[in-house]
């Protein structure tokens, strides 16, 4: 989902020039030290260079900026603010750059920024105002259309004393700045739950990727506001069953495709509605691959092949009949 440049020729700047130039104002379209630049492709790549900060002398023409595989650690406020501003910058990839803190207003003064990838950074401290830029209750709309936040969960010992889910959601909702967001990827973040208010405030979402998390239930999550959602990736979670309310909401979204592979479906009496729905719906991709994980006697049975007689629950004995 991140931008790739065209195969135009890249010019590399000579590292030994960096110190000589740094004291002077940057030339308008020079290439920063340790980067490769292609004006034709409007692309700058500063990849796997162990950079500890964002280069100050980025060329004004840059539309696609790759700062992957570095050691940035902290992204301060106005990390990309320049005079004149980087008015053309549309796609920014910061994945795998050892970022553990993104401060308020880190992406301010990027009026054309449509695509942002912060994946594979251990974000222990993501400011609530990282994307909105201000603590106003309603901020200026962000131009972001795609936000890629896959595998940004820090190691457990580096997490703050707060919910990681809550920290991420606070950044997504602050100032209602991300109302225009169309793609949100939150895969591989050990999410145990999805805060119920997050989806209601992202009405433009077309693609939502929650795959490879630890979601157990969607009972309190509403998809109703995501009227034009096209893909919902829930593969590789810990889902046991989808209940009627969720099924009805998904069925009511006319453009949706739902991806449910590799969840530990529990095939007991509570699964009956979901099985009935699966047999009728067209919205689930690869529905014939969904299999039971529990109970043991049902393991590997295909959900589509089950009937109501297969889906029973062990009766709960009244206390007087229970034995110790």
């Amino acid at each position: 989902s991140s931008p790739t440049s065209s195969a135009s020729s890249f010019s590399s700047s000579a590292p030994f020039l960096a110190s000589a130039v740094s004291a002077q104002p940057p030339l308008p379209d020079q290439c920063p030290a340790l980067c490769e630049c292609s004006e034709a492709a409007r692309t700058v790549k500063c990849v796997n260079r162990n950079l500890t900060e964002v280069p100050t002398d980025l060329p004004a023409y840059v539309r696609n900026l790759f700062l992957t595989g570095n050691q940035l650690a902290v992204l301060p406020a106005g990390a990309f603010a320049r005079r004149p501003p980087l008015a053309e910058l549309a796609a920014l990839n910061l994945s795998g750059s050892r970022l553990d803190e993104v401060r308020a207003g880190a992406f301010e003064h990027l009026p054309s920024l449509r695509q942002l990838d912060l994946s594979h950074n251990p974000l222990a401290d993501l400011s609530p105002f990282a994307f909105s830029g201000s603590n106003a209750s309603v901020s200026a709309p962000s131009p972001l259309v795609e936000l890629i936040l896959n595998h940004i969960v820090p190691p457990e010992d580096e997490r703050q004393n707060r919910s990681f889910e809550g920290m991420v959601v606070a950044a997504l909702l602050a100032g209602r700045a991300l109302q225009g967001l169309r793609r949100l990827e939150l895969a591989s973040n050990h999410f145990l739950y999805l805060p119920r208010d997050v989806l209601a405030q992202l009405p433009s979402l077309r693609h939502l990727d929650l795959s490879n998390n630890s979601l157990v239930s969607l009972t309190y999550v509403s998809f109703r506001n995501l009227t034009h959602l096209e893909s919902l990736h829930l593969e590789d979670n810990a889902l046991k069953v989808l209940h009627n309310g969720t099924l009805a909401e998904l069925q009511g979204l006319p453009h949706i495709r739902v991806f449910l592979d590799n969840n530990p479906w529990v095939c007991d009496c509570h699964m009956a509605d979901m099985v009935t729905w699966l047999k009728e719906t067209e919205v689930v991709q690869g529905k014939d691959r969904l299999t039971c994980a529990y109970p043991e006697k049902m393991r590997n049975r295909v959900l589509l092949e089950l009937n109501s007689a297969d889906l029973d629950c062990d009766p709960i004995l009244p206390p007087s009949l229970q034995t110790s």
Partner: antibody, heavy 115, light 107 residues
Framework: EVQLVQSGAEVKKPGATVKISCKVS????????MNWVQQAPGKGLEWIGR????????NYNGKFKGRVTITADTSTDTAYMELSSLRSEDTAVYFC????????WGQGTLVTVSS | DIQMTQSPSSLSASVGDRVTISCRAS??????LNWYQQKPGKAVKLLIY???RLHSGVPSRFSGSGSGTDFTFTISSLQPEDIATYFC?????????FGGGTKLEIK
Amino acid sequence: EVQLVQSGAEVKKPGATVKISCKVSGYAFSSSWMNWVQQAPGKGLEWIGRIYREDGHTNYNGKFKGRVTITADTSTDTAYMELSSLRSEDTAVYFCANGGAMDYWGQGTLVTVSS
Amino acid sequence: DIQMTQSPSSLSASVGDRVTISCRASQDISNYLNWYQQKPGKAVKLLIYYTSRLHSGVPSRFSGSGSGTDFTFTISSLQPEDIATYFCQQDNTLPWTFGGGTKLEIK
């Protein structure tokens, strides 16, 4: 901005098959759904069908079912609409339209069916 | 299939006028109603989706309202470049269906 570029005009004989292409550029923000719409001369718009490009899932309008096949090649970001057993009333401009709500449209491809 | 009935089929108005077009669905389509603009020889443009949401880059003089079966499209102050044919379309229930179109002309 998403742009859709369709293949050129076609002239076909009754009973023949036509295959129209639609190439997507500006892909980063394009939709997974590609729709096809027919507009006969002096007439309104009629939805033919759609494809979800990532997994090939299709929906068709019953009026065209059995004669139309919609496919997509994700490696080239191109969608195709093939209409078989052509008859004179299939003479029309055919549009591809990207998005659930058909956000962006191609310029149209005129197909003329004439003996 | 859901029938979409659009009225009027043509209308003539002056620059600066407020113009309204109606669209009625043969059954409830919630808010899944879109409006498109078609100019001769140009690509069709989405103006409004989900009854009232303005598509990106569309001027704010265009608006939409309604729900269920009855919908309205409004141009608050007609401009010369608005001369076109306008279509409504439902995307609530397959197959998607369009209204017959409204041809808008300048007086």
